[in-house]
Interface confidence: low
């Protein structure tokens, strides 16, 4: 999906006023410093595409994040703001039903919202222009 | 614990430059913004400009036209604020201040403990 | 630019009085920021996003107001609360009221 369109506004509010605060929760008791930061984003397109990728694309050792409250909120503000985003994500959602697990908060799962979270921050703030 | 420790005073005579640092820590020092904002005797608080550490992009107050120029050492986790042609009236208490991005309008959440500019001939 | 005037210069109260500052801007801004500076120290943040309380801060500091005009209260002057606060907006540029120096009567 090609994010361009976005409005971008838009997905910073739902950020700032939910997704945020679920983020802190789901890595409530973890140092800040405890993992490093190793995934970046050039602008607002790439930074939702690489949140998009972390959220929702399950990975060696974290399989569960879509189900979480900050992946739901996240896929309704890309659903309502991304123009065509929901039709994309059907088939995609279908599948995601079937091979889910149990619910299982692995170190895997914390290091990768913790990186979720570099990204948002960084889709929160364009970078200035150099001069 | 982040902190942001600034270099000391300084004395120059008019005319010089000036360059003052600002080091980080406890943070991850490319994640924020940093500003410098400077405040001369009585008077209000004054932004100067500001640096992403992430690619170097600045922004200046365009009072200072030109005389201002901020810089960042990503390896030392350092931001710069150099003013050159300096005057009297540039005689200030010289903060970095770190601009969190968890706050919608981006707060200056952390600020150095300030450096004395003395301008005089 | 956006310039923001506060009011009064100085306000002359109590302990245990109710403390009620202005701050003004020349045009519509989204959200006002509030620090307090006492002499010989840095700027420390009271209040992020009109509302919101910095971390630490205690309950009787809170913020209101919304496109030009903003409030800072403070419910009950405590002996420390007596120094200089600040709003700031963020546009392109960011700026500073005049300030207001809380001193005490």
């Known amino acids: 999906y090609d994010f361009t369109n976005c409005d971008f506004e838009k997905i910073k509010a739902a950020y700032l006023s939910t997704i945020s605060k679920d983020l802190i929760t789901y890595m409530s008791g973890t140092k800040s410093t405890e993992f490093n930061n190793t995934v970046s984003c050039s602008n607002r397109p790439h930074c939702l595409t690489e949140i998009q990728s972390l959220t929702f694309n399950p990975t060696a050792g974290c399989a569960s994040l879509a189900k979480e409250m900050f992946a739901m909120k996240t896929k309704a503000a890309l659903a309502i703001w991304c123009p065509g985003y929901s039709e994309t994500q059907i088939n995609a959602t279908q599948a995601m039903k079937k091979r889910r697990k149990r619910k299982v908060t692995t170190n895997k799962c914390l290091e990768q919202v913790s990186q979720l979270q570099g990204l948002w921050r960084r889709f929160n703030r364009p970078l200035l222009k150099q001069q | 614990e982040v902190q942001l420790v600034q270099s000391g005073a300084e004395v120059k005579k008019p005319g010089a430059s000036v360059k003052v640092s600002c080091k980080a820590s406890?943070?991850?020092?490319?994640?924020?913004?940093m500003n410098w904002v400077r405040q001369a005797p009585g008077q209000r608080l004054e932004w100067m400009g500001i640096i992403s550490p992430y690619n170097g992009g600045t922004s200046y107050n365009q009072k200072f036209k030109g005389r201002v120029t901020i810089t960042r050492d990503t390896s030392a986790s350092t931001a710069y604020m150099e003013l050159s042609s300096l005057r009297s009236e540039d005689t200030a208490v010289y903060y970095c201040?770190?601009?969190?991005?968890?706050?919608?309008?981006?707060?200056?959440?952390?600020w150095g403990q300030g450096t004395t500019v003395t301008v005089s001939s | 630019e956006i310039v923001l005037t506060q009011s009064p210069a100085t306000l002359s109260l109590s302990p245990g009085e109710r403390a009620t500052l202005s701050c003004r801007a020349s045009s519509s801004v989204s959200y006002m920021h509030w620090y307090q500076q006492k002499p010989g120290q840095a700027p420390r943040p009271l209040i992020y996003?009109?509302?919101n309380l910095a971390s630490g801060i205690p309950a009787r500091f809170s913020g209101s107001g919304s496109g030009t005009d903003y409030t800072l209260t403070i419910s009950r002057l405590e002996p420390e609360d007596f120094a200089v606060y600040y709003c700031?907006?963020?546009?392109?540029?960011?700026?500073f009221g005049g300030g207001t120096k809380v001193e005490i009567k």
């Open positions: 406890g943070y991850t020092f490319t994640d924020d913004y």
């Open positions: 700031q907006q963020w546009s392109s540029n960011r700026t």
């Open positions: 201040a770190r601009e969190d991005y968890d706050y919608d309008g981006y707060a200056m959440d952390h």
């Open positions: 996003a009109t509302s």
